[in-house]
């Protein structure tokens, strides 16, 4: 499936739109809001009852090349005594983001948009109990 | 930009970095993954730091719909089902890349935009600041 074209419900295509070959789109990868910073609470990944670690994945043919992934440290959750409670579950919270993939076919290069699922952190949930009949 | 390896047999005119503007295939790889977090899991309700999901819609952006999490409580849900303020619910935020129509309203011309979204919530031990 493709990116939806602009529907007449919202607006008409302006005359100022750049010409684009069929089946492709023009993408400026100079990022808007490049310098905004995440203002997340201090070190929540270690203060959480479902703590997590971060690993950086690197791919020179991807833009951005660096993507940070979280992994839950425990299967259970950390209780008030600092011990793992396996009656609760640490589970990953995921979010999709877009990346640009650079593909080499011989000496020619093409670009492809790709959805990547990023694990952002973990949360502590009550488990779903499946009883055997 | 990002330096990428090049086939040694190719002409040297090729830039090692990602160019500022690229032509991209309209088809998105992995496009059909589930974008509605309410359908993909019920963690938002089962979490000890539950959250509500708010729909953010913008036709000038792809994806046009993004779900924003807002922690339901300031405290966390304890074993008795009460909200316990000895612990705090906090949002987990993530910067994601989206496409912004540029110039506005153009169907096939975009610019990458970084936006900050709250994806869910987690329960943390609070940092206590006492007055001296």
């Amino acid at each position: 499936r493709k990116i939806p074209k602009v529907g007449h419900t919202f607006f008409q295509k302006p005359e100022s739109c750049p010409p684009v070959p069929g089946g492709s789109m023009k993408l400026d990868i100079g990022i808007i809001n490049e310098n905004q910073r995440v203002s997340m609470s201090r070190n929540i990944e270690s203060r959480s009852t479902s703590p997590w670690n971060y690993t950086v994945t690197w791919d020179p043919n991807r833009y951005p090349s660096e993507v940070v992934q979280a992994q839950c440290r425990n299967l259970g959750c950390i209780n008030a005594q600092g011990k793992e409670d396996i009656s609760m579950n640490s589970v990953p919270i995921q979010q999709e983001t877009l990346v640009v993939r650079r593909k080499h076919q011989g000496c020619s290069v093409s670009f492809q948009l790709e959805k990547v699922l990023v694990t952002v952190g973990c949360t502590c949930v009550t488990p779903v109990i499946h009883h055997v009949q | 930009g990002i330096t990428i390896p090049r086939n040694p047999g190719c002409p040297n005119s090729e830039d090692k970095n990602f160019p500022r503007t690229v032509m991209v295939n309209l088809n998105i790889h992995n496009r059909n993954t589930n974008t509605n977090p309410k359908r993909s899991s019920d963690y938002y309700n089962r979490s000890t730091s539950p959250w509500n999901l708010h729909r953010n819609e913008d036709p000038e952006r792809y994806p046009s719909v993004i779900w924003e999490a807002k922690c339901r409580h300031l405290g966390c849900i304890n074993a008795d089902g009460n909200v316990d303020y000895h612990m705090n619910s906090v949002p987990i935020q993530q910067e994601i890349l989206v496409l912004r129509r540029e110039p506005p309203h153009c169907p096939n011309s975009f610019r990458l935009e970084k936006i900050l979204v709250s994806v869910g919530c987690t329960c943390v031990t609070p940092i206590v600041h006492h007055v001296a």
């Epitope: 203002s39 | 509500n52 708010h54 339901r72 300031l74 909200v83 705090n88 949002p91 006492h130 007055v131």
Partner: antibody
């Protein structure tokens, strides 16, 4: 129009029980938290308890063992069951609506007129 | 429990003059999420309390713009730029960052 009307107050002997009601109109209890706050004559405000929009609760731990908050969505009503009452529980009891769960302000935006509870022998 | 200390406890003011009430909390009211759940209420004589300011500095709907709130962490202030006769009553500060939620002891504003 948002309205909160408390009832059920009265004179009760020490050790007795009382159930206060708060009838809400103009909004739905499954979209708002509602608090109980009390005020002894000539004194300040003391927070008692809250039931949040999702049905979870938070109590003033000093009162939790004796007081229980509940609600009945079908009647759009809130209750405060008070047991083992003492003279120190004598006060006007207000129910107050918390701001809408989509606003996340955690402030009490509308208050009822209050119902008076007197604990005396 | 968080102790909220207001000053002054009594505030006689001439109509048209400014007024200021301070409130200090025994612990920071900044939640782990970065927000501060500090509010001001007014209880007019014979009435129920009413919300004036929420989350430090936001005026509740219908509250005149002569009321303003400021502060951070543990120290907060309510200012009335020009006091009017209808502003008399007891002003309470309150916090909902930590449970139990607590109120200040109240500041009684009266007209001179």
């Amino acid at each position: 129009e948002v309205q909160l009307v408390e009832s059920g107050g009265g004179l009760v002997q020490p050790g007795g029980s009382l159930r206060l009601s708060c009838a809400a109109s103009g909004f739905s209890l499954d979209s708002y938290g509602v608090h109980w706050v009390r005020q002894a004559t000539g004194k300040g405000l003391e927070w008692v308890s809250v039931i949040w929009s999702d049905g979870t609760t938070t109590y003033n731990s000093a009162l939790k063992s004796r007081f229980t908050i509940s609600r009945e969505n079908a009647k759009n009503s809130l209750y405060l069951q008070m047991n083992s009452l003492r003279a120190g529980d004598t006060a006007v009891y207000y129910c107050a609506r918390d701001t809408h769960y989509r606003l996340y302000y955690y402030a009490m935006d509308y208050w009822g007129q209050g119902t008076t509870v007197t604990v005396s022998s | 429990d968080i102790v909220m200390t207001q000053s002054p406890l009594s505030l006689p003011v001439t109509p048209g003059e400014p007024a200021s009430i301070s409130c200090r909390s025994s612990q920071s009211l900044v939640h782990s999420n970065g927000d501060t759940y500090f509010h001001w209420y007014l209880q007019k004589p014979g009435q129920s309390p009413q919300l004036l300011i929420y989350k430090v500095s936001n005026r509740f709907s219908g509250v005149p713009d002569r009321f303003s709130g400021s502060g951070s962490g543990t120290d907060f202030t309510l200012k009335i730029s020009r006091v009017e006769a209808e502003d008399v009553g007891v002003y309470y500060c309150s916090q909902t960052t930590h449970a139990p939620f607590t109120f200040g002891q109240g500041t009684k504003l009266e007209i001179k």
